[in-house]
């Protein structure tokens, strides 16, 4: 049985496996998926007090 929700992670830390461009790692599914399948936090308005985190689930560089 597939493990539970350990996923929805960003690329702030090294993913367990690299993804090709235009793909992002879904740690729950344990594989790379199209980045458009994963939803990121709402962008903060300009001048927000909290710095915008790097949560875009961008492809591995």
């Amino acid at each position: 049985m597939r493990r539970g929700p350990r996923s929805l992670r960003g690329r702030d830390a090294p993913a367990p496996t690299p993804c090709v461009p235009a793909e992002c790692f879904d740690l729950l599914a344990r594989h790379c998926v199209a980045c458009g399948l994963l939803r990121t936090p709402r962008p903060k308005p300009a001048g927000a007090s909290s710095p915008a985190p790097r949560t875009a689930l961008q492809p591995q560089e």
Epitope: G4, S7, L8, G10, A13, L37, L38, P41, R42, S50
Partner: antibody
């Protein structure tokens, strides 16, 4: 903006099956994760499970084999089925969707369920 | 399951003062250098509202009076200064390990 709306019965008898619908607008349920959460009288919150972009489901083990989450992508709806309900299932049921880290930033307004004979 | 223990259970704070709510996890909720801890506010008749995610990141549209800190097993939500509109129940939630779990809640009141 994503909007979620729960619908279903407000009263179910013990041993019956609860069926709830979450209707989603503003995003497709073929992306992201789509959760069910409930809040019991006394304010305890419980994560019940989800269905994700690929149709993969996860269920809280506390619900054993009583729970099923399904979806209809053509209607952009997902569903909760909870079998053999008891009075302990009396709660407010929410559908919600999380962003990157599992933090749920969009919620339905909730539907209150009473299980009573 | 990871158990989240919130303290205090209830809290009365004067307007304009600081409110501090603690959430302790039974095991670390850190993974890949990220703390998978989030904070919500819930008012009667409303769904929970996300305030803070990833321990310290302010959700879009949430006032900077709200802040979060911590890592590993010990986390804190701070509201400074407290306003009348902040009367609510506050919950922590972890998404580090399945199943996701919530703290028992802290009820904030105005003194």
């Amino acid at each position: 903006e994503v909007q979620l709306q729960e619908s279903g019965p407000s009263l179910v008898k013990p041993s019956q099956t609860l069926s709830l619908t979450c209707s989603v607008t503003g995003d497709s349920i073929t992306r992201g994760y789509w959760n069910w959460i409930r809040k019991f009288p006394g304010n305890k919150l419980e994560f019940m499970g989800y269905i994700n972009y690929s149709g993969t489901t996860y269920y809280n083990p506390s619900l054993k084999s009583r729970i099923s989450i399904t979806r209809d992508t053509s209607k952009n709806q997902y569903y909760l089925q909870l079998n053999s309900v008891t009075t302990e299932d009396t709660a407010t049921y929410y559908c919600a969707t999380p962003h990157t880290y599992g933090a749920m930033d969009y919620w339905g307004q909730g539907t209150t369920l009473t299980v009573s004979a | 399951d990871i158990v989240l223990t919130q303290s205090p259970v209830s809290l009365a704070v004067s307007l304009g003062q600081r409110a501090t709510i603690s959430c302790r996890a039974s095991e670390s909720v850190d993974d890949y250098g990220i703390s998978f801890m989030h904070w919500y506010q819930q008012k009667p008749g409303q769904p929970p509202k996300l305030l803070i995610y990833r321990a310290s990141d302010l959700e879009s549209g949430i006032p900077a009076r709200f802040s979060g800190s911590g890592s590993g097993t010990d986390f804190t939500l701070t509201i400074n200064p407290v306003e009348t509109d902040d009367v609510a129940i506050y919950y922590c939630q972890q998404t580090s390990k399945d199943p996701w779990t919530f703290g028992g809640g802290t009820k904030l009141e105005i003194k």
